[in-house]
């Protein structure tokens, strides 16, 4: 089957958050379909998303096998209705993706404040540890399991009655901060990997949680 009317994919882009990783590309297919291959620098090519009319392919299952490897993907274009033919020697047009190293490049997902508890003039704020699709012995690992001390959280907190923000940092998932008695505070957290030097160093801020709402507890 010929490939004369097929167009090579372009704008291959990795979209990855907390290691959930999707390769996207253009163009939207007209009379053609795509197959994706992925490999490590030293490994063999593995085909995924066979003859798809989509312009994205979820490669999470492959990259979570070793998030510290560097991966390369390529997208092949075939005529619509293409069936693999053993006699065909003509290589279909394809385009390579940029290299992708999940550990360095996956974006940090928006964190969530799990709880906060006030005891006198101290508030303990706990950040939920997000699960990833990275596995160890058939159990899924959390973001903390994967990044360890590479991952810190920044807490932004302010009195409900004012706009002046204070910050605190932790390399655990907990903050213990001093507050003024009788004041209500609001909180937002951000995940940060300080060792990164790129735009994906920080997550977006968590939703704001304020004292006096259901996530909080107050004890004198």
């Amino acid at each position: 089957s010929g490939t004369t009317n097929t167009v090579a994919a372009y704008n291959l882009t990795w979209k990855s958050t907390n290691f959930k990783t999707i390769l996207e590309w253009e163009p939207k297919p007209i009379n053609q379909v795509y197959t994706v291959q992925i490999s490590t620098k030293s490994g063999d090519w593995k085909s995924k998303c066979f003859y798809t009319a989509d312009t994205e392919c979820d490669l999470t299952d492959e990259i979570v096998k070793d998030v510290k490897q560097t991966y390369l993907a390529r997208v092949f274009s075939y005529p619509a209705g293409h069936v693999e033919s053993t006699g065909s020697t003509e290589e279909p047009p394809y385009e390579n993706s940029p290299e992708f190293t999940p550990y360095l490049e996956t974006n940090l997902g928006q964190p969530t404040i799990q709880s906060f508890e006030q005891v006198g003039t101290k508030v303990n704020v706990t950040v939920q540890d997000e699960w990833t699709l990275v596995r160890r012995n058939d159990t899924f690992l959390s973001l903390r399991d994967v990044f360890g001390k590479d991952l810190i959280y920044t807490l932004y907190y302010w009195k409900s009655s004012s706009s002046g923000k204070k910050t605190a940092k932790t390399n655990t998932n907990e903050f213990l901060i001093d507050v003024d008695k009788g004041e209500n505070y609001c909180f937002s957290v951000q995940a940060v990997i300080p060792s990164r030097r790129t735009a994906n160093r920080k997550s977006t801020d968590s939703p704001v949680e304020c004292m006096g709402h259901e996530k909080g507890e107050s004890r004198e």
């Epitope: 360095l104 540890d129 001390k149 991952l151 907990e174 990164r196």
Partner: antibody, heavy 120, light 113 residues
């Protein structure tokens, strides 16, 4: 097979400069921290600092900050520990090590060590 | 800085007998996020670099014999060798792998009787 190969033994005089190296192979060099550990003669292990070659980010033990510099050249998968002015008290075995795959999972692989002797 | 204190500093054990080393940290090594203790154990055999035995307080590194086991949480940790063998001689170190600066215990020297 993961390997860390360190440069050979050095004999130096106080005040001289020195750079020792640690070449990694058999793994993706940019995504694992390289740790540097000092062991003075007959003594225990002291963590000096580390570097993530992919970004060049470093952490130092305050006891060594300003006296040593940790760097890496990812194009040749090599990390370095250097001194601009050696002291007799720098006489020690220096090990490089590679962090484990998981977060905070120890130093999984070690170099053979570089013996540095500083004497007038 | 987190201070790591090992006891005893030396022990002499008959082959086939058990051995136990204690390690106490000046601050908790328990990560609230994933409930893991970031305490690591190493063995340094004579004339060799250290080798990783146990991480996350109780997870044996690949290839480490199952006679080695780690336990404990928070600030108190123990390394046990169920039946000491001649090849186990050397200095055992615990390490805070929780927060910078990473710190080691003073070491425990194991000898064979």
């Amino acid at each position: 097979e993961v390997q860390l190969v360190q440069s050979g033994a050095e004999v130096k005089k106080p005040g001289e400069s020195l750079r020792i190296s640690c070449k990694g192979s058999g793994y993706t060099f940019i995504t694992y921290w390289i740790e540097w550990v000092r062991q003075m003669p007959g003594k225990g292990l002291e963590w000096m600092g580390d570097i993530l070659p992919g970004s060049g980010s470093t952490n130092y033990n305050e006891n060594f900050k300003g006296h040593v510099t940790i760097s890496a050249d990812k194009s040749i998968s090599t990390a370095y520990l250097q001194w601009s002015s050696l002291k007799a008290s720098d006489t020690a075995m220096y090990y490089c090590a590679r962090s484990g795959y998981y977060g905070n999972s120890g130093f999984a692989y070690w170099g053979q060590g570089t013996l540095v002797t500083v004497s007038s | 800085d987190i201070v790591m204190t090992q006891t005893p500093l030396s022990l002499s054990v008959t082959p086939g007998q058990p051995a136990s080393i204690s390690c106490k940290s000046s601050q908790s090594l328990l990560s609230s996020g994933n409930q893991k203790n970031y305490l690591t154990w190493y063995l340094q055999k004579p004339g060799q670099p250290p080798q990783l035995l146990i991480y996350w307080a109780s997870t044996r590194e690949s290839g480490v014999p199952d006679r080695f086991s780690g336990s404990g949480s928070g600030t108190d940790f123990t390394l046990k060798i169920s039946r000491v063998e001649a090849e186990d001689v050397g200095v055992y170190y615990c390490q805070n792998d929780y927060t910078y600066p990473l710190t080691f215990g003073q070491g425990t020297k194991l000898e064979i009787k």
